[in-house]
């Protein structure tokens, strides 16, 4: 478990552009601190790949049932993974028909975690 | 053009550390994804892991965890793989291999020349 | 772990025949599969990506199919520069596994 005094505070600052195909998805994490410009959605994906989405986005929200039906179902204790848990992040296009260059803002890492290629993160202490 | 260069071939003794870069031109460095892969003599392709240049995260392949350590340094667009602790059956070339594509996909576009990594008392 | 199993190991063909190599995926990966050629003493080559959508710039006598566990890559008129190990590469999880390959030889 980080140390909840010194745990580092994770930031969106753009937002995917694309649907993340549903199937691709291993569950979320919502940033909804003050400290952040914007509230973000986290989908971390089976690659452990994490992607920040606009969580006003109605794909973004169906997503986000769709995750806590599927988690309800196989960890009725946890409704999503501890940031911990979230591994790595990656470069987007994310249609799986490639040929985009990674937009590194719009996948993000905590201090914490092991990959990412996007947003920034800082540590609040 | 795209283009990956790494170091040279690497002679070293059982229970040392080698460690290869992998220089990246042609693209931008922090904008993907690098991984590496090995190839013992004679044999198939191995993931080992990738390093996120952005912000130098990392994922391993379990059974390198605890022996490998992906590094990279941005202001010379390079990457680095360490691997510890040596055995004779690391013997191998190492590849670092970019990697093009999405949250959920994974494709290696271009790949380094190799670096032949022998292990011998 | 996912297992990728290439079959045949080696094959040998003529200059201008169609070459068929299969790879069984041991768990359901959709279209998660990739093909990469290998030439000796060189790096992979990407020439299939998502089971059957050719690389940019890779002639299209290369061709890939299939899904769920079972894909097919195939060359339809064998080059005398197509002699080489070939690979499928699964995404679908991780770790990211490989066949173990199929070496190509003409005859």
């Known amino acids: 478990q980080p140390d909840a005094v010194n745990a580092p505070l994770t930031c969106c600052y753009s937002f995917t552009s694309k649907m993340i195909p549903m199937s691709r998805l291993e569950s979320y994490k919502r940033i909804t601190s003050s400290r952040c410009p914007k509230e973000a959605v986290v989908f971390v994906t089976k690659l452990k790949r994490e992607v920040c989405a606009d969580p006003k986005k109605e794909w973004v929200q169906t997503y986000i049932k769709n995750l806590d039906r599927n988690q309800m179902r196989s960890e009725p204790t946890t409704l999503f993974k501890t940031a911990s848990a979230l591994r790595s992040s990656a470069p987007l296009n994310v249609k799986l028909t490639r040929k985009s260059e990674a937009n590194a803002s719009t996948t993000f890492s905590t201090t914490t975690s092991s990959t990412s290629v996007g947003v920034t993160s800082v540590t609040v202490n | 053009q795209v283009q990956l260069v790494q170091s040279g071939a690497e002679v070293k003794k059982p229970g040392a550390s080698v460690k290869v870069s992998c220089k990246a031109s042609?693209?931008?460095?922090?904008?993907?994804?690098l991984h590496w892969v090995r190839q013992a003599p004679g044999q198939g392709l191995e993931w080992m892991g990738w390093?996120?240049?952005?912000?130098?995260?990392?994922n391993y392949a379990q059974k390198f965890q605890g022996r490998v350590t992906m590094t990279r340094d941005t202001s010379i667009s390079t990457a680095y793989m360490e691997l510890s602790r040596l055995r004779s059956d690391d013997t191998a070339v190492y590849y670092c291999?970019?990697?093009?594509?999405?949250?959920?996909?994974?494709?290696?576009?271009?790949w380094g020349q190799g670096t032949l990594v022998t292990v011998s008392s | 772990d996912i297992q990728m199993t290439q079959s045949p190991s080696s094959l040998s063909a003529s200059v201008g025949d169609r070459v068929t190599i299969t790879c069984q995926a041991s768990?359901?990966?959709?279209?998660?599969l990739n093909w990469y050629q290998q030439k000796p003493g060189k790096a992979p080559k990407l020439l299939i990506y998502?089971?059957?959508n050719l690389e940019t710039g890779v002639p299209s006598r290369f061709s890939g199919s299939g899904s769920g566990t079972d894909f097919t890559f195939t060359i339809s008129s064998l080059q005398p520069e197509d002699i080489a190990t070939y690979y499928c590469?699964?995404?679908?999880?991780?770790?990211?596994?490989f066949g173990q390959g199929t070496r190509l030889e003409i005859k």
């Open positions: 998502d089971a059957s």
């Open positions: 042609g693209y931008t460095f922090t904008g993907y994804y």
């Open positions: 390093i996120n240049p952005y912000n130098d995260g990392t």
């Open positions: 768990q359901d990966i959709t279209t998660y």
């Open positions: 291999a970019r990697d093009i594509a999405a949250a959920g996909a994974v494709y290696f576009d271009y």
């Open positions: 590469q699964q995404y679908d999880n991780l770790p990211i596994t």
